[in-house]
Interface confidence: low
C-alpha cells in the first residue's frame, strides 16, 4: 500500500559535540520492520544510515558517519524511526533525506539540521 514519509517540519538544532535525533515516520502508520529505511545527504546521496533486511547496513555508510549513527527502532512497528547522530560536527549542518522503501514503492522526506557552536555567546549589554 501507499504511504507518505514525514520528517520534522522545522530545522532541528544541535550543538557541536552533542548528539542529535532526527525523527521520521510513515503515514498512515504501519509496521516498517520489513522495509528499507535510510537517511542520505543530498545532493550527492551520501549514505548516513541504512537499515535493510531487518538490520543496519554499516558497510554502506559514508566514512564520515561510520560509528556515529544509531537507528532507534522502538516504534518501527508503528512506522516511526529516529536517527541518532553522535558527536555532531559543523559539517553535519544542512539537509538530510529520510526514506522508506517497501518493495518497489519508495517515499522520502527532507529535513534540516542546524549546528551551533556551544562556546559562542553574546556578552550582556
Amino acid at each position: 500500500g501507499q504511504f507518505r514519509v514525514i520528517g520534522p517540519r522545522h530545522p532541528i538544532r544541535a550543538l557541536v559535540g552533542d548528539e542529535v535525533e532526527l525523527p521520521c515516520r510513515i503515514s498512515p502508520g504501519k509496521n516498517a520492520t520489513g522495509m528499507e529505511v535510510g537517511w542520505y545527504r543530498p545532493p550527492f546521496s551520501r549514505v548516513v544510515h541504512l537499515y535493510r533486511n531487518g538490520k543496519d547496513q554499516d558497510g554502506d555508510q559514508a566514512p564520515e558517519y561510520r560509528g556515529r549513527t544509531e537507528l532507534l527502532k522502538d516504534a518501527i512497528g508503528e512506522g516511526k524511526v529516529t536517527l541518532r547522530i553522535r558527536n555532531v560536527r559543523f559539517s553535519d549542518e544542512g539537509g538530510f533525506t529520510c526514506f522508506f522503501r517497501d518493495h518497489s514503492y519508495q517515499e522520502e522526506a527532507a529535513m534540516e539540521l542546524k549546528v551551533e557552536d556551544p562556546f559562542y555567546w553574546v556578552s550582556p549589554g
Epitope: 504511504f3 522545522h10 538544532r13 525523527p23 503515514s27 498512515p28 502508520g29 522526506a109
Partner: antibody
C-alpha cells in the same frame, strides 16, 4: 489529564489589541508544537497560527499575518497569542490546541481548550 | 491554499443508521487528513487522523478512509451522542485548512 485553559478574551474596539494566554498541564509542554484555531459565531473552524516545541519557528494564516504573534514560555507551560490591529472579522472563539506529534510535520490536534471569546466591535 | 469541501452540509438520520460524510481536497494531500466532532458550545474532538487511524478512546463505529483528494468518514451505527457537527482538516501543507462542516441532526 491534559488540560488547556485559555484566558484573555473580551470586547475590544477595532484597531485595538488583546493578548490571549493558554495554560497547559498534564503533558510535557516543551516537547509539543502548539496552535491557535478560531471559530467565528455560527461558522466553521479556521487555523490561525502554530509554533514549534522550542518557539523557534512560527507559522500564520494569511488573514492574521503581520497582526498576530504567537509565542510560548516553556518554563511557565503557557502559550500566547498577541493580537494587534484587530478587525470585526477577527471576532471568534479562540481555541488553543495541542499538536498530536512533538516536532514532526503534520499538525492536527488531539487536545483543545474550552475556548475564549474575542469580540471586536465599536 | 488547499480548499476542503465537505458534503453534505447537513443530514438528518435516525439512531442505528449508517452515516457517510465525504471530504474532497482541491489538490492531493496523500493521507494527511483528520476528522473532528464538535458539539454546540464545546471544543472539537479528534476522531480520526492519517485518514484512517482511529484516535484512542474513540468508538470503533467511527472509521475513515480515502487518500489523495477524496475521503470518507463513516459512522456504522449512529448513536444518540453522535449528533453533532463533523469537520475534516488537511495537514499536508500550510496553511492547515478545515472543511466547512457537516451537521448531523436527528430525523
Amino acid at each position: 489529564e491534559v488540560q488547556l485553559v485559555e484566558t484573555g478574551g473580551g470586547l475590544v474596539q477595532p484597531g485595538g489589541s488583546l493578548r490571549l494566554s493558554c495554560a497547559a498541564s498534564g503533558f510535557t509542554f516543551s516537547s509539543y508544537a502548539m496552535s491557535w484555531v478560531r471559530q467565528a459565531p455560527g461558522k466553521g473552524l479556521e487555523w490561525v497560527s502554530d509554533i514549534n516545541h522550542s518557539g523557534g519557528s512560527t507559522y500564520y494564516a494569511d488573514s492574521v499575518k503581520g497582526r498576530f504573534t504567537i509565542s510560548r514560555d516553556n518554563s511557565k507551560h503557557t502559550l500566547y497569542l498577541q493580537m494587534n490591529s484587530l478587525r470585526a472579522e477577527d471576532t471568534a472563539v479562540y481555541y488553543c490546541a495541542k499538536d498530536y506529534y512533538d516536532i514532526l510535520t503534520g499538525s492536527f490536534f488531539d487536545y483543545w481548550g474550552q475556548g475564549t471569546l474575542v469580540t471586536v466591535s465599536s | 491554499d488547499i480548499v476542503m469541501t465537505q458534503s453534505p452540509s447537513s443530514l438528518s438520520a435516525s439512531v442505528g443508521d449508517r452515516v457517510t460524510i465525504t471530504c474532497r481536497a482541491s489538490q492531493g494531500i496523500s493521507s494527511a487528513l483528520a476528522w473532528y466532532q464538535q458539539k454546540p458550545g464545546k471544543a472539537p474532538k479528534l476522531l480520526i487522523y492519517d485518514a484512517s487511524s482511529l484516535e484512542s478512546g474513540v468508538p470503533s463505529r467511527f472509521s475513515g478512509s480515502g487518500s489523495g483528494t477524496d475521503f470518507t468518514l463513516t459512522i456504522s451505527s449512529l448513536q444518540p451522542e453522535d449528533f453533532a457537527t463533523y469537520y475534516c482538516q488537511q495537514f499536508n501543507s500550510y496553511p492547515w485548512t478545515f472543511g466547512q462542516g457537516t451537521k448531523v441532526e436527528i430525523k
